[in-house]
Interface confidence: medium
């Protein structure tokens, strides 16, 4: 496999826009949810105040074959400065509680909305 040339880039998305787009995608997931999200798959709960973006990705990346969260997984991969692979838990320092993907998405959405309201686009 040879990969020459990255995806076309119209310019960097400002952090505030990137965060808003992620929030919109999570809203979309929660509103369109009919059957249990990702067949009720369980993921590790994360500390939403500690290196949240990589931790969220490290948790969600272990869910495969769930088209509903594929875009979220892609978006989060751009929010994390290091490459994340399934089974990697470098940011998930504490792995003690598993929750359903649907609950994980709701918790993440609430936290991101709070950050957005407070203008924390870091």
């Amino acid at each position: 496999l040879t990969c020459l040339g990255g995806f076309a880039s119209p310019g960097p998305v400002p952090p505030s826009t990137a965060l808003r787009e992620l929030i919109e995608e999570l809203v979309n997931i929660t509103q369109n949810q009919k059957a249990p999200l990702c067949n009720g798959s369980m993921v590790w709960s994360i500390n939403l105040t500690a290196g949240m973006y990589c931790a969220a990705l490290e948790s969600l990346i272990n869910v495969s074959g769930c088209s509903a969260i594929e875009k979220t997984q892609r978006m989060l991969s751009g929010f994390c400065p290091h490459k994340v692979s399934a089974g990697q838990f470098s940011s998930l320092h504490v792995r003690d509680t598993k929750i359903e993907v649907a609950q994980f998405v709701k918790d993440l959405l609430l936290h991101l909305k709070k950050l957005f309201r407070e203008g924390q686009f870091n």
């Epitope: 040339g5 990255g6 960097p12 500690a50 290196g51 949240m52 686009f121 870091n122």
Partner: antibody, heavy 118, light 109 residues
């Protein structure tokens, strides 16, 4: 042993384009993001962008996004950084550097000096 | 775009303690900025000291530590050695790009 070996120094005229290569060994290039950093003489460090060599997805710094293109050739384990429309203030050392959680920016190329002069 | 500011220069006595800070123009630095600290000596590539706010690289001496202090990222050098004289840079991640700090020249005198 992990190594990042960059192409040699370049002297170019304003308006030209430079292409710098970064050949990696000791690991598979698709396993980690590759970042590029600029350092002008006597100045600080500037992040230019990064690539996921696995799928070619890139992120660029706002300052450089309209002039920089970062690519990767997985068949030769080589990353590239192309900077176009060169001006005198682009005279700098350019570094490629590997990033992963357990060793962010732990491995650096030796640097490539680009001199832009008419 | 955010601006990341550091003290231009700091002087520390051998064996003394000095704290370098890294301020973000957009507000408080958090763990989601994945703060990195680098040391650079003349003619050399930068070397990572601290990553992810407070994790030491394997080669980083225990006298260097990273933290969050009053809304800023901080690098504390306790028990300074002559070989610690160098330029120090921080880098903060802003959701989809890094920004390096302006750099601090540390003199051990």
């Amino acid at each position: 042993e992990v190594q990042l070996v960059q192409s040699g120094a370049e002297v170019l005229k304003p308006g030209a384009t430079v292409l710098i290569s970064c050949k990696v060994s000791g690991y598979t290039i698709t396993d980690y993001y590759m970042h590029w950093v600029q350092q002008a003489p006597g100045k600080g460090l500037e992040w230019m962008g990064r690539i996921d060599p696995e799928d070619g997805e890139t992120k660029y710094a706002p300052k450089f996004h309209d002039r920089v293109t970062i690519t990767a050739d997985t068949s030769t384990d080589t990353a590239y950084m192309e900077l176009s429309s060169l001006r005198s203030e682009d005279t700098a050392v350019y570094y490629c550097t590997r990033y992963d959680y357990y060793g962010p920016f732990a491995y650096w190329g030796q640097g490539t000096l680009v001199t832009v002069s008419s | 775009q955010a601006v990341v500011t550091q003290e231009p220069s700091l002087t520390v006595s051998p064996g003394g303690t000095v704290t370098l800070t890294c301020r973000s123009s957009t507000g408080a630095v958090t763990t989601s900025n994945y703060a990195n600290w680098f040391q650079q000596k003349p003619g050399q590539a930068p070397r990572t000291l601290i990553y992810g706010t407070n994790n030491r690289a394997p080669w980083t001496p225990a006298r260097f530590s990273g933290s969050l202090l009053g809304g800023k990222a901080a690098l504390t050098l306790s028990g300074a050695q002559p070989e610690d004289e160098a330029e120090y840079y921080c880098a903060l991640w802003y959701i989809n790009h890094f920004i390096f700090g302006t750099g601090t020249k540390v003199t051990v005198l």
